[in-house]
């Protein structure tokens, strides 16, 4: 079977900065130590510009 995403909603310790696995529409926010609703990362042609390359940061990494 393929890897399954875990929806982890537990509070994490203040010094925890390692992303937990979130579901498809979420990402881990270290500030609030939880998975939160996340928008797709914007690239310059969608109204956001940066000197950094957003790269492939459109979706969370698949869990292993």
């Amino acid at each position: 079977m393929g890897a399954r995403r875990l929806r982890v909603r537990s509070q994490r310790s203040r010094d925890s900065s390692v992303p937990t696995q979130c579901n498809q529409t979420e990402c881990f926010d270290p500030l609030v130590r939880n998975c939160v609703s996340c928008e797709l990362f914007h690239t310059p042609d969608t109204g956001h510009t940066s000197s950094l390359e957003p790269g492939t940061a459109l979706q969370p990494q698949e869990g292993s």
Partner: antibody, heavy 125, light 107 residues
Framework: EVQLVESGGGLVQPGGSLRLSCAAS????????IHWVRQAPGKGLEWVAW????????DYADSVKGRFTISADTSKNTAYLQMNSLRAEDTAVYYC??????????????????WGQGTLVTVSS | DIQMTQSPSSLSASVGDRVTITCRAS??????VAWYQQKPGKAPKLLIY???FLYSGVPSRFSGSGSGTDFTLTISSLQPEDFATYYC?????????FGQGTKVEIK
């Protein structure tokens, strides 16, 4: 249209209480974090508290811990800040704000993108 | 708590000038820094998030850079509507702390 509207500010005596409301429209507060930030007259911005309404997780600035309580009612799409044992140094404009997150390799990259208009709290005898 | 130290606290500049504001964190915050603009009597507005990404609708004359502990907000050509106070904020660790602000005034 995304909007945050605060209410509940006013004049209160030291030791008194106030409850601020932050009514959200145009989005659901359920799956994000809502923050209260204050600004004393002529001063800079100071974060006060946050809540993740989907699970009720909260955190507070040391300066308000034990006196202020942040809460949310997802059915009303509204966040609250209950302020007790108010002091003169709590006098400020109080803003609520939502934190937007963009997904960078599974981690939030974001900031406070929508703010309310602010509500003035004056603590004075 | 992480301290965010902005410099300068105020500056005077003319329309068309290039303006640079710096922010130093007391510890490594990766790229978890946002920049806000605030005008008197108004709520702050998000300009830059994740140190260098321009928020939607913000003019391209604003740019941000940095990682770790040192961050910069640059206005490439100052416009009349840019005279305001600017704040940096780290959002890696609670409490999310703001810099003390930089007031950009007309020379």
């Amino acid at each position: 249209e995304v909007q945050l509207v605060e209410s509940g500010g006013g004049l209160v005596q030291p030791g008194g209480s106030l409850r601020l409301s932050c009514a959200a429209s145009g989005f659901s507060i359920r799956s994000i974090s809502i923050h209260w930030v204050r600004q004393a007259p002529g001063k800079g911005l100071e974060w006060v508290a946050w809540i993740t309404p989907f699970n009720g997780t909260t955190d507070y600035a040391d300066s308000v811990k034990g006196r202020f309580t942040i809460s949310a009612d997802t059915s009303k799409n509204t966040a609250y800040l209950q302020m007790n044992s108010l002091r003169a140094e709590d006098t400020a404009v109080y803003y609520c704000a939502r934190r937007v997150c963009y997904n960078r390799l599974g981690v939030c990259a974001g900031g406070m993108d929508y703010w309310g208009q602010g509500t003035l709290v004056t603590v004075s005898s | 708590d992480i301290q965010m130290t902005q410099s300068p606290s105020s500056l005077s500049a003319s329309v068309g000038d290039r303006v640079t504001i710096t922010c130093r964190a007391s510890q490594d915050v990766s790229t978890a820094v946002a920049w806000y603009q605030q005008k008197p009597g108004k709520a702050p507005k998000l300009l830059i998030y994740s140190a260098s990404f321009l928020y939607s609708g913000v003019p391209s004359r604003f740019s941000g850079s940095g990682s770790g502990t040192d961050f910069t907000l640059t206005i490439s050509s100052l416009q009349p509507e840019d005279f305001a106070t600017y704040y940096c904020q780290q959002s890696l660790i609670t409490p999310p702390t703001f810099g003390q602000g930089t007031k950009v005034e007309i020379k």
